[in-house]
Interface confidence: medium
């Protein structure tokens, strides 16, 4: 058993039929010494009297608020959750495993630049009765700084029969070196609780490997005199890091037809602009991604060619 | 090249340089970029790599005040890495493809360092400990690890070189 | 040729300081972590202390945390372990020692130096 | 844990293999391979002999071997000479970045 945060304790159990569970001792916060009586959650059942009570935690009908009593009075709470562990694997219930990159992955996390900041996410379908705590560092063993907000509730989507729901949260690294080759990963914990079922989730990575910059900005197209060529132009987007001499991208152009089965034309270049063919009811598209280091591309930015 | 008493390096080949460096690292181990080189413990144990770091002056600031340092800690690395790719763990089993770029980047870190340091200037470099991998499984994975290494160090590199050929070059 | 060298043991009373300093020489002591370990009379080896070599990251035995603080200059090529509040059972020869850790390999006290000695007593 | 458990002591004719264990816990021995061993002679400095549980560093004769199974190390010295009598220490890194050795092991040679 371990405490969460203040009265919140978690018990880990190892979940198989007639496991024989934690014994939990519950010590009443107080001074007083006679006269108490404990319950759980909202039964009126006295379960045991004595400032400690010692409970066999099984399944989660053992789990819930114990509450201390004195003559009518409430002198303190222990909220008890439970842990499971199957097989030696602790649950993951609570979230959805998002299959990308990997099995596995219940949170994934991006950075539109190398300032250090960075969003994650995850989805679950449960709806109500569900809290998140996010903790993030660099390093573990010597662990530096990251800020986290809360986790919100960012999107709700349904998938077949079932609703989808997307939290997300904003973690910033306290002292950032943008320029400097990481070493050290970041560490990121998600602390899960459903009712009383505890879970927690880690994702470990470099800000490097998980950058996605925005799509360019003002993308236009510019039409050259006695040809079907036009000039293509873009800009950086406002959120990569500067100066750009130093944080540079590289760009994807693709020209895609009404079609999807039509040939797409691609050029690659560094430069923040192209020349290309713009056929008859095509779109001009164009994507960024760190100039020195493979990481993901950017979404399109896209101009129809008419 | 870079001059002891500081002179400047020749940007522009440096840039060149770098630009094919990162190409390569990629190219080399492509697919490394989608597997999770970081077991438990790792934390601790890839500490001792010569790691391009805040202190080290390779910011955009830093190498308008003073790009020598810098360009020893990349010289360092360079070296570092150029020794690891000549070593037994990519010359021994399991044979690299005759096609590999794992030639070509030796090469290409050999010849940059050599654009940073000139016959007759010798900054100190590290002497690279011996890692003998005693199995072709893990020389394998120690090939995955280095060249996912070697892909940060570079991309960070070549940031230095691209800003000084763009904002530095007289 | 790898050289390591102690300097800095002698005799001191409980509670008193000594600092202790190993010269490196034959290699790069800017890139190895490095340790210090510990060997009381006719007793074990015992690890005491490491340091990353950029010094951004120190590690330390239960028995010394809190009194000794293991410390670098990398320009000077010189380690350091200043030892504060020592006690009787600190009574040991003290060996600088290099170690490395390279993609998930790790490897302690490849090369050792010949030691120091301390003696704590009243 | 402080320290890694290893016999006291280990003897053998010359010619015999003899095996020292070195048993720890899953926090360092049985947490990963990262484990040494040490030959000390009277008066000279330790030496290592072995590291990654097998790996030889060059100019150590193939007469020592190491191997590992769960949270137990093992060294091997094949062919026993009276030059091996001398003390030897297991050492592991641990999961949480330190270091701890093994109580050593005189071995002499009958």
């Known amino acids: 058993i371990w405490e969460l945060k203040k009265d919140v304790y978690v018990v880990e159990l190892d979940w198989y039929p007639d496991a024989p569970g934690e014994m939990v001792v519950l010590t009443c916060d107080t001074p007083e010494e006679d006269g108490i009586t404990w319950t759980l959650d909202q039964s009126s059942e006295v379960l045991g009297s004595g400032k400690t009570l010692t409970i066999q935690v099984k399944e989660f009908g053992d789990a819930g608020q114990y509450t201390c009593h004195k003559g009518g009075e409430v002198l303190s709470h222990s909220l008890l959750l439970l842990h499971k562990k199957e097989d030696g694997i602790w649950s993951t219930d609570i979230l959805k495993d998002q299959k990308e990159p990997k099995n596995k992955t219940f949170l994934r996390c991006e950075a539109k630049n190398y300032s250090g900041r960075f969003t994650c996410w995850w989805l679950t379908t449960i709806s109500t009765d569900l809290t998140f705590s996010v903790k993030s560092s660099r390093g573990s063993s010597d662990p530096q700084g990251v800020t986290c907000g809360a986790a919100t509730l960012s999107a709700e989507r349904v998938r077949g029969d079932n609703k989808e729901y997307e939290y997300s949260v904003e973690c910033q690294e306290d002292s950032a070196c943008p320029a400097a080759e990481e070493s050290l990963p970041i560490e990121v914990m998600v602390d899960a609780v459903h009712k009383l079922k505890y879970e927690n989730y880690t994702s470990s990575f470099f800000i490097r490997d998980i950058i996605k910059p925005d799509p360019p900005k003002n993308l236009q197209l510019k039409p050259l005199k006695n040809s079907r060529q036009v000039e293509v132009s873009w800009e950086y987007p406002d959120t990569w890091s500067t100066p750009h001499s130093y944080f540079s991208l590289t760009f994807c152009v693709q020209v895609q037809g009404k079609s999807k089965r039509e040939k797409k034309d691609r050029v690659f270049t560094d430069k923040t602009s192209a020349t290309v063919i713009c056929r008859k009811n095509a779109s001009i598209s164009v994507r960024a991604q760190d100039r020195y280091y493979s990481s993901s591309w950017s979404e399109w930015a896209s101009v129809p060619c008419s | 090249r870079a001059v002891p008493g500081g002179s400047s390096p020749a940007w522009t080949q440096c840039q060149q340089l770098s630009q094919k460096l990162c190409t390569l690292a990629w190219s080399a181990h492509p697919l490394v970029g989608h597997m999770d080189l970081r077991e438990e413990g790792d934390e601790e144990t890839t500490n001792d790599v010569p790691h391009i770091q805040c202190g080290d002056g390779c910011d955009p600031q830093g190498l308008r005040d003073n790009s020598q340092f810098c360009l020893q800690r990349i010289h360092q690395g360079l070296i570092f890495y150029e020794k690891l790719l000549g070593s037994d763990i990519f010359t021994g089993e399991p044979s690299l493809l005759p096609d590999s770029p794992v030639g070509q980047l030796h090469a290409s870190l050999l010849g940059l360092s050599q654009l940073l340091q000139p016959e007759g200037h010798h900054w100190e470099t590290q002497q690279i400990p011996s890692l003998s991998p005693s199995q072709p499984w893990q020389r394998l994975l120690l090939r995955f690890k280095i060249l996912r290494s070697l892909q940060a160090f570079v991309a960070v590199a070549a940031r230095v070189f691209a800003h000084g050929a763009a904002t530095l070059s007289p | 040729e790898v050289q390591l060298l102690e300097s800095g043991g002698g005799l001191v009373q409980p509670g008193g300081s000594l600092r202790l300093s190993c010269a490196a020489s034959?290699?790069?002591?800017?890139?190895?972590?490095m340790m210090w370990v510990r060997q009381a009379p006719g007793k074990g080896l015992e690890w005491v202390s490491s340091?990353?070599?950029?010094?951004?990251?120190?590690m330390y035995a239960d028995s010394v945390k809190g009194r000794f603080t293991i410390s670098r200059d990398n320009s000077k090529n010189t380690l350091y372990l200043q030892m504060n509040s020592l006690r009787a059972e600190d009574t040991a020869v003290y060996y600088c020692?290099?170690?490395?850790?390279?993609?998930?390999?790790?490897?302690?006290?490849?090369?050792w130096g010949q030691g120091t000695l301390v003696t704590v007593s009243s | 844990q402080s320290e890694l458990t290893q016999p006291a002591s280990v003897s053998g004719s010359p010619g015999q293999s003899i095996t020292i264990s070195c048993s720890g816990t899953?926090?360092?021995?049985?947490?990963?391979?990262?484990v040494s061993w040490y030959q000390e002679r009277p008066g000279k400095v330790p030496k290592l002999i072995i590291y990654?549980?097998?790996n030889r560093p060059s100019g150590i004769s193939s007469r020592f071997s190491g191997s590992k199974s769960g949270n137990t190390a093992s060294l091997t010295i094949s062919g026993l000479q009276a030059e091996d009598e001398a003390d030897y220490f297991c050492?592991?890194?641990?999961?949480?970045?330190?270091?701890?050795f093994g109580t050593g092991t005189k071995v002499t040679v009958l």
């Open positions: 020692t290099r170690g490395w850790a390279l993609f998930g390999v790790v490897r302690m006290g490849d090369y």
């Open positions: 340091i990353r070599p950029s010094g951004g990251m120190t």
């Open positions: 034959g290699f790069t002591f800017s890139m190895y972590r």
């Open positions: 050492n592991s890194y641990t999961i949480t970045g330190t270091y701890v």
């Open positions: 990654d549980v097998n």
């Open positions: 899953s926090s360092d021995v049985g947490g990963h391979n990262f």
